[in-house]
Structures are given as C-alpha cells and as structure tokens.
C-alpha cells in the first residue's frame, strides 16, 4: 500500500490521543533506554510503511502484536485516514486469522514495540529541513 495520500495530521492526532497510551501500557515496566532503534524512516509515508510492517507482520519471536490494542487502533486510524487502505488489508486479515496464536509478551515483542515507538516518534515530528 502507498501511504502518500493519507491524512497525516489526523493520524498524528489519533496516535497522540489513543495509540500512544496503549503503547505506554504495553511498554510499562520497560526502561526507554533498554532497546536501541535499528529501524528508521525518512518521511511520513515511509514511517507508516515501516509502522504497518512492524505492527502487522509476524516476526520470529513475536507473532502476536496485531491483536494488541495499539495495533487495532493503528489499523482503525489507517483505515479511516488512508484512502483505499481497508481494501488492501482484507486478504492479509484473513491470512492472519488462520495464524492466530496465544498472546504472549516476549522480550522480542517488547523490542519490536520499542522500534515502533521510535517510528511513531519520527512520524510525529513536523518536517525538518536538512542543513
């Protein structure tokens, strides 16, 4: 999906008011300095591409993020504020239902959500001019 035509300000507002709170809850008890960011993004569409990938694509050691509250709210925000996003996700959602596993917060998941935190932080910044 190409995130270029999303309403970034509306997604930013959704992140600040709700998604961030669920990330805070998920990461509670974890020091902000515990994990270093290894995933970055260069502009808002790129940030959303990376956010979608980390949030909804199962990875080795962390298969369950898509069912977390922050993930569901992320999905809702993208569906509302990114034209045509919902249609692209129907097949992916059906595939995910078949893979559904028990929710377990592993260290790998905490690390992945820490990466998400960094991506959202970068998405959140208004455009910075390169010197």
């Amino acid at each position: 999906y190409d995130f270029t035509n999303c309403d970034f300000e509306k997604i930013k507002a959704a992140y600040l008011s709700t998604i961030s709170k669920d990330l805070i809850t998920y990461m509670s008890g974890t020091k902000s300095t515990e994990f270093n960011n290894t995933v970055s993004c260069s502009n808002r569409p790129h940030c959303l591409t990376e956010i979608q990938s980390l949030t909804f694509n199962p990875t080795a050691g962390c298969a369950s993020l898509a069912k977390e509250m922050f993930a569901m709210k992320t999905k809702a925000a993208l569906a509302i504020w990114c034209p045509g996003y919902s249609e692209t996700q129907i097949n992916a959602t059906q595939a995910m239902k078949k893979r559904r596993k028990r929710k377990v917060t592993t260290n790998k998941c905490l690390e992945q959500v820490s990466q998400l935190q960094g991506l959202w932080r970068r998405f959140n910044r208004p455009l910075l001019k390169q010197q």
Epitope: K12, A13, Y15, L16, S17, S20, K21, L23, I24, S32, T33, N36, N37, S40, S42, Q117, G118, W120, R121, R122, F123, N124, R125, P126, L128, K129, Q130, Q131
Partner: antibody, heavy 119, light 107 residues
C-alpha cells in the same frame, strides 16, 4: 539514566559569537531529537528550535533564524547551539531538552547554561 | 504561531488544598501538551506529557487533563515542596510554544 550535561557559564562581548554544548548520555543519541530553549525574566521560556541528530534536519522559531544555528556531533553525542551577533537581549539561560520517548513532548532537561552579554 | 495562554500568573494555596492551573491554546493542539515544574534556581522538570500521562517518578497528586484547546494541571493535596513555577508547552506544530508561567505560592 538519561543525562544532558551542558557547558559552563559564558561572559561575552556584544557582537561576538558563542557556541554552547549539551552532551547526552544514557540513551542512543541518534534516536531522539534535541530541542533548545531560552529563558529570560522578561520573555519567560522560548523555544529556539530542534535538531534530528541522525539526519541533521532542523527547525527554528522565526525569531531565532539567523541568530541561532543548531548542530549535532554523533561521535561525541553532543548537541550545540551557536549564537551570533550577540546583544544584551541574548543574555539568558539556555537549556537543551530531549524529545520524549513517545513524541509530542520533551522529557529530560539539561542544567542550563547562563550566557551574559556585556561590554 | 500557536499561542498558549496561562491566565493565572500567580496562585495562592494552602498545604492540603487542591489547585487547578489552566492553559488555553489559540487553536486545536489535540493532546500534544506537556506540563513542567520549575523550582527557583533549577531547570524545568517534566510532570505531564501528552495532556494526561504522568512522567516517570512524578507523584500521583499531579494529574493532567484536556484536549483540543483547553488543558488543566491539577495538584491535589498540595505540599510545601510544590512551591514553584508551572508552565505548559504545545508540541503539535513548529514552532513549539510555551504558556506564560503560573507561580504557585503556599500560604
């Protein structure tokens, strides 16, 4: 833990330039934007601008464009603000402050650097 | 630029009281508001971020509320160590802007 250590007080002549530093420790320097804030008794707190250490990207308040230049040195995890063509109006306490973990706020503050501009 | 207005420059309260410090934005800043405390001779300290989240180590007598244009910092059961300046900051859009401080005095 996160610490922002700022350089010591400066006394400089009008018309000169000065470069204040802020050494970050306890976190990955390139992961967080750094902001600079000016505080005076008359104007209170004023946001000067911000820098993304990873890209060198910056943003400034209009008032400080041409007055302040923000830079960052990744190798030493240090952020800088250079102030030029100094006048008595630039006398203030300058703070560096780090972007918050979730964005949309700043969390940790340096101890501040007092700049006095006087002939 | 977005203007943040703290209409109360001074507030006088007694130990054990509850006090509300308010901040009004000139346009919608959603929940991108933080509250800071500054004691004499010290650098500011973060109390509340994203309008209602308490920063690490901040006592639970400090609470933040609001969204859009109207924000409130509530200090319940005021303690003598709460004598300080309090200010809000909007971080929705550059340039980020501070409210004028509210000086809390303890009777």
């Amino acid at each position: 833990q996160v610490q922002l250590q700022q350089s010591g007080a400066e006394l400089v002549r009008p018309g000169a330039s000065v470069k204040l530093s802020c050494k970050a420790s306890g976190y990955m320097f390139t992961d967080y934007a750094m902001h600079w804030v000016k505080q005076t008794p008359v104007h209170g707190l004023e946001w000067i601008g911000t820098i993304d250490p990873e890209t060198g990207g910056t943003a400034y308040t209009q008032k400080f464009k041409g007055k302040a230049t923000l830079t960052a040195d990744i190798s030493s995890s240090t952020a800088y603000v250079e102030l030029r063509s100094l006048t008595s109006e630039d006398s203030a306490v300058y703070y560096c402050t780090r972007e918050g973990s979730y964005g949309g706020y700043v969390d940790y503050w340096g101890q501040g650097t007092t700049l006095s501009v006087s002939s | 630029d977005i203007v943040m207005t703290q209409s109360q420059k001074f507030m006088s309260t007694s130990v054990g009281d509850r006090v509300n410090i308010t901040c009004k934005a000139s346009q919608n800043v959603h929940t991108a508001v933080a509250w800071y405390q500054q004691k004499p001779g010290q650098s500011p300290k973060t109390l509340i971020f994203l309008a209602s989240n308490r920063h690490t180590g901040v006592p639970d007598r400090f609470t933040g509320s609001g969204s859009g244009t109207d924000f409130t910092l509530t200090i319940s059961n005021v303690q003598s160590e709460d004598l300080a300046d309090y200010f809000c900051l909007q971080l929705w859009n550059y340039p980020y802007t501070f409210g004028g401080e509210t000086k809390l005095e303890i009777k």
